[in-house]
């Protein structure tokens, strides 16, 4: 079955101001790619490559196409049914503690570990001692001796808004 | 591959009812939105509504709501749609076509069904 | 509505002529207007959507351009083939208008 949103579904940012408010229409709601008139009766196209929208609705207007940070490429453009793909430049990665920006890969792994993780989009190099095989999760590799790695570049994106 | 099948033509007297029928195959029948367009002999087309099998959402042209309306059967891929109080400037060529859930364009499109409304 | 006015009506060429049909929109549509061809008989066929992009299968002669109210069908060389009455569509606000259509046939 369609997922939908309403109104209620979005941050309080992406709400229409009150006056705009209305209750759904009898037949509802509006196909992605879509939003609702003021009045209900009319579905509204969304703007290719400036708003979207995913799901059926009944929003007032589409959502903003995201547009990727300096330091992130674009997998993808805006559409009108999704948005923009970003993903990290090749040797950053984005965290989920820290989504707002793409952060510097580790070039090596510390004395006494080993690296069994390449540099993805969405995660640092993984290294993890040699004897006992348990992961480090320092940020920054000893600064005497490290394993280099290079990059890697899979395609699958980081960040998938929309 | 994509197919829409209508029914067959249909000679009417004003006042009645017709129900057209068109059969989709060669596609998930739920992830498009099945439309009613028509075209009088010599016209333009003029769409007239569209039905939702995903979740049922049924829109129409507000010039045809008082006299249309569109159902589906999902066992048999099946969008039906019946135009009632016939009148003789409802002769057309009534089509059913298929779009993406997105930009309303129609990407695919049944044969077409005549219906005559003649006393 | 939005009133979808095509010019010309009618249209005659010449095999290996360029065509253009032009389509006005009565307000601001963006860019979403679709173009069909429609040969006598049959069900009308997509050439073109967003105003601009191609349908899978259409030959690259078919192009489209505009935005908000003026829109453009070109056909760079005519051919035989596209011997049809061609239609715009606006995909912008329901309910979906067409133009009256443009027929076009070969000198």
């Known amino acids: 079955e369609s997922a939908l949103i309403t109104q209620q579904d979005l941050a309080p940012q992406q709400r229409a101001a009150p006056q705009q408010k209305r209750s759904s229409p009898s037949e509802g709601l509006c196909p992605p790619g879509h939003h609702i008139s003021e009045d209900g009766r009319d579905c509204i196209s969304c703007k290719y490559g400036q708003d979207y929208s995913t799901h059926w609705n009944d929003l007032l207007f589409c959502l903003r196409c995201t547009r990727c940070d300096s330091g992130e490429v674009e997998l993808s453009p805006c559409t009108t049914t999704r948005n923009t793909v970003c993903q990290c430049e090749e040797g950053t990665f984005r965290e989920e503690d820290s989504p707002e920006m793409c952060r510097k890969c580790r070039t090596g792994c510390p004395r006494g570990m080993v690296k069994v993780g390449d540099c993805t989009p969405w995660s640092d190099i993984e290294c993890v001692h040699k004897e006992s095989g348990t992961k480090h999760s320092g940020e920054v590799p000893a600064v005497e001796e490290t394993v280099t790695s290079s990059p890697g570049t899979p395609a699958s994106p980081c960040s998938l808004s929309g | 591959q994509v197919q829409l099948v209508q029914s067959g033509a249909e000679v009417k007297k004003p006042g009645a009812s017709v129900k057209v029928s068109c059969k989709a195959s060669?596609?998930?029948?739920?992830?498009?939105?099945l439309h009613w367009v028509r075209q009088a002999p010599g016209q333009g087309l003029e769409w007239m509504g569209w039905f939702y099998p995903g979740n049922n959402n049924i829109k129409y042209n507000e010039k045809f709501k008082d006299r249309v309306t569109i159902t589906a059967d999902k066992s048999t891929s099946t969008v039906y749609m019946e135009l009632s109080s016939l009148r003789s400037e409802d002769t057309a060529v009534y089509y059913c076509?298929?779009?993406?859930?997105?930009?309303?364009?129609?990407?695919?499109w049944g044969q077409g069904t005549l219906v005559t409304v003649s006393s | 509505d939005i009133q979808m006015t095509q010019s010309p009506s009618f249209l005659s060429a010449s095999v290996g002529d360029r065509v253009t049909i032009t389509c006005k929109a009565s307000q601001d549509v963006n860019t979403a207007v679709a173009w069909y061809q429609q040969k006598p008989g049959k069900a009308p066929k997509l050439l073109i959507y967003?105003?601009?992009t191609r349908h899978t299968g259409v030959p690259s002669r078919f192009s489209g351009s505009g935005s908000g109210t003026d829109f453009t069908l070109t056909i760079s060389s005519l051919q035989p083939e596209d011997v049809a009455t061609y239609y715009c569509?606006?995909?912008?606000?329901?309910?979906?208008?067409f133009g009256g259509g443009t027929k076009l046939e070969i000198k």
């Open positions: 060669g596609y998930t029948f739920t992830e498009y939105i």
């Open positions: 076509a298929r779009h993406e859930q997105g930009p309303g364009y129609f990407d695919y």
């Open positions: 569509q606006q995909h912008y606000i329901t309910p979906w208008t």
């Open positions: 967003w105003a601009s």
